[in-house]
Interface confidence: low
């Protein structure tokens, strides 16, 4: 399926709107600090060139690869060296090394201001130019989330414009907009984290890791589909994600559209739940398929033990085609257990593989592997017990209290990790309670385990940028599926040398009074992490006293007439009382 001009091919397949949107995303994900108008110029240049190639595929330059064309545009940016430093060195390389170089400079934590939605300003911008508004959303999200799944971002941008379409005509714009934007924000952040995990899986553990994850997920969603069908879907889906993670956004979006078409054309053999999705237009269709509920498990499925424990030929089957045999084990297990987390299903498959490796080398393999399902039981029990304990704690403490308990837990485990990262990760971990503990039993494990995988991947990604803890590196790199059990098993670090008490970190000003509640919480939680880094062995009682003193101090000064004076006088007293309480 070769084309004379790749750019013309993609432009024709995707249409101008999607082409422009995807190019804008690509540029924004690479050059995260460039202003919007700069990107628009680059996009327009490339779009005009694509149109030239559509009109005449043999036009000069039209035969170039997309990486070459994209890279040439990026390297034209005048301020490349001042703004991005050694990223400019990428431009001295040839493809494919140049693109690899650009990819390696993507920043997962760019220093960009928080987006604060102001309904009136946003509605004015929306009414002035809907197209520009749409593009600005793509740009702002893409530069903050350099691995965001591009075709899905187009979907969210349309939804976002839809919200403004509806709310900017409302009497109270804020009341209409803000809750909708917040709901969308949560979804967008989760979507970003999911794609970041997919890309990390491919980059750090190879595409086999993503394929295994997808086999489990799709088998749960489509339990009526045959193994061959699931394998085909997994192969196609892996290609889509590989392309998006590699910055090949036009190919990725095009292939994703083809996959959605294939799924809908073959829905009779895939799932009975797809009908509604398949009636939708492209972007909604693909999103809907990705989120579709799990189909009912077919009746009268034989017990798993028949093929994988009782059969005398298990070792023969395994040794003849290891990947296919383990794949079918994962498929059969997953389609029977929609209530298990994907990560748990992958641990089961890993343990099953290890058992076969051990047993098939013995004199009586069958006697060895026939009890394998009993051996696997603990892998299901462990997360179930952990979920029960943590949900009990969440119900007792509430989200904020649970976050603080996790801050204590994780700061003691890995005190070397930066304070902002510990706060961010612990806050996210605490939200698992709100998100998952309220769900019915059958949904708790997938919700918890798979959400934790996303958060721990964020920790791993941030830690990789500036590694400070061997324990974190070990948990992040040894095994993708065992990351969560690895972190759960960490104990307080006894080798850690406490930080000296830094008064600066406990100096506060009147600006804290006007902060939104969330920002206030983050300030308090930052102080809590710093306290623990100073006194890792502080008791719960000591920490409680210090935090209560801190809250009382903030409340008192924020109620004072001269707030700044109050902070100046009471702040040093707080430092003394804190040191005393921790002595």
């Amino acid at each position: 399926d070769t084309h004379k001009s790749e750019i013309a091919h993609r432009f024709k397949d995707l249409g101008e709107e999607h082409f422009k949107g995807l190019v804008l995303i690509a540029f924004s994900q690479y050059l995260q600090q460039c202003p919007f108008d700069e990107h628009v110029k680059l996009v327009n240049e490339l779009t005009e060139f694509a149109k030239t190639c559509v009109a005449d595929e043999s036009h000069a330059g039209c035969e170039k690869s997309l990486h070459t064309l994209f890279g040439d545009e990026l390297c034209k940016v005048a301020s490349l060296r001042e703004t991005y430093g050694d990223m400019a060195d990428c431009c001295e390389k040839q493809e494919p090394e140049r693109n690899e170089c650009f990819l390696s400079h993507k920043d997962d934590s760019p220093d960009l201001p928080k987006l604060k939605p102001d309904p009136n300003t946003l509605c004015d911008e929306f009414k002035a130019d809907e197209k520009k508004f749409w593009g600005k959303y793509l740009y702002e999200i893409a530069r903050r989330h350099p691995y965001f799944y591009a075709p899905e971002l187009l979907y969210y941008a349309n939804k976002y414009n839809g919200v403004f379409q509806e709310c900017c005509q409302a009497e109270d714009k804020g009341a209409c907009l803000l809750p909708k934007i917040e709901t969308m924000r949560e979804k967008v952040l989760a979507s970003s984290a999911r794609q970041r995990l997919r890309c990390a899986s491919i980059q750090k553990f190879g595409e086999r890791a993503l394929k295994a994850w997808s086999v489990a997920r799709l088998s749960q969603k489509f339990p009526k589909a045959e193994f061959v069908e699931v394998t085909k879907l997994v192969t196609d889906l892996t290609k889509v994600h590989k392309e998006c993670c590699h910055g090949d956004l036009l190919e990725c979006a095009d292939d994703r559209a083809d996959l959605a078409k294939y799924i809908c054309d073959n829905q009779d053999t895939i799932s009975s739940k797809l009908k509604e999705c398949c009636d939708k237009p492209l972007l909604e269709k693909s999103h809907c398929i990705a989120e579709v509920e799990k189909d009912a498990i077919p009746e009268n499925l034989p017990p798993l033990t028949a093929d994988f424990a009782e059969d005398k030929d298990v070792c023969k089957n395994y040794q003849e085609a290891k990947d296919a045999f383990l794949g079918s084990f994962l498929y059969e297990y997953s389609r029977r257990h929609p209530e298990y987390a994907v990560s748990v299903l992958l641990r089961l498959a890993k343990e099953y593989e290890a058992t076969l490796e051990e047993c098939c080398a013995k004199d009586d393999p069958h006697a060895c592997y026939s009890t394998v399902f009993d051996k696997l039981k603990h892998l299901v029990d462990e997360p179930q017990n952990l979920i029960k304990q943590n949900c009990d704690q969440f119900e007792k403490l509430g989200e904020y209290g649970f976050q603080n308990a996790l801050i204590v837990r994780y700061t003691r485990k890995v005190p070397q990790v930066s304070t902002p990262t510990l706060v961010e990760v612990s806050r996210s971990l605490g939200k698992v309670g709100t998100r998952c503990c309220t769900k019915p039993e059958s949904e708790r494990m997938p919700c918890t385990e798979d959400y934790l995988s996303l958060i721990l991947n964020r920790l791993c990604v941030l830690h990789e940028k500036t590694p400070v803890s061997e324990k974190v590196t070990k948990c992040c790199t040894e095994s993708l599926v065992n990351r969560r059990p690895c972190f759960s098993a960490l104990t307080p670090d006894e080798t850690y040398v406490p930080k000296a008490f830094d008064e600066k970190l406990f100096t506060f000003h009147a600006d804290i009074c006007t902060l939104p509640d969330t920002e206030k919480q983050i300030k308090k939680q930052t102080a809590l992490v710093e306290l623990l880094k100073h006194k890792p062995k502080a008791t719960e009682e000591q920490l409680k006293t210090v935090m209560e003193n801190f809250v009382a101090f903030v409340d008192k000064c924020c109620a004072a007439d001269d707030k700044e004076a109050c902070f100046a006088v009471e702040g040093p007293k707080l430092v003394v009382s804190t040191q005393t309480a921790l002595a």
């Epitope: 249409g15 101008e16 709107e17 999607h18 809907e130 197209k131 749409w134 187009l154 349309n158 939804k159 414009n161 839809g162 379409q165 005509q169 939708k280 237009p281 492209l282 972007l283 909604e284």
Partner: nanobody, 126 residues
Framework: EVQLLESGGGLVQPGGSLRLSCAAS????????VAWFRQAPGKEREFVAG????????YYADSVKGRFTISRDNSKNTLYLQMNSLRPEDTAVYYC???????????????????WGQGTLVTVSS
């Protein structure tokens, strides 16, 4: 230049259904944002439902949400409005409107649509 021709209107009892069609010529229908508007006697023209150009995200007025469905068949270059559970207050002349240039989303503002059909009358009465 886009020409639009509506059909499918008529008299229907409350609770009944009708399907309106709007055939477009002069431009591909998937390259335009298209919408249905209606105008009851003595009232302003109001937005009913719309579908974006190229991206196909749909929008509905609150009064018809869950009862009406907008769709298009690109191969036939035709826009549809499936109207179920019709009520007397749905009585109006229904117009099809187009806004070329592949706008990403539809607009509820009638003035933004340069191309209009001549309308088809829908009467809901027992």
């Amino acid at each position: 230049e886009v020409q639009l021709l509506e059909s499918g209107g008529g008299l229907v009892q409350p609770g009944g259904s009708l399907r309106l069609s709007c055939a477009a010529s002069g431009r591909y229908i998937d390259e335009t944002a298209v919408a249905w508007f209606r105008q009851a006697p003595g009232k302003e023209r109001e937005f009913v439902a719309g579908i974006g150009g190229g991206v196909d995200i749909t929008y509905y007025a609150d009064s018809v949400k869950g009862r009406f469905t907008i769709s298009r068949d690109n191969s036939k270059n035709t826009l549809y409005l499936q109207m179920n559970s019709l009520r007397p207050e749905d009585t109006a002349v229904y117009y099809c409107a187009a806004r070329p240039g592949k706008p990403l989303i539809t607009s509820k503002v009638a003035d933004l649509y340069p191309y209009w059909g001549q309308g088809t009358l829908v009467t809901v009465s027992s």
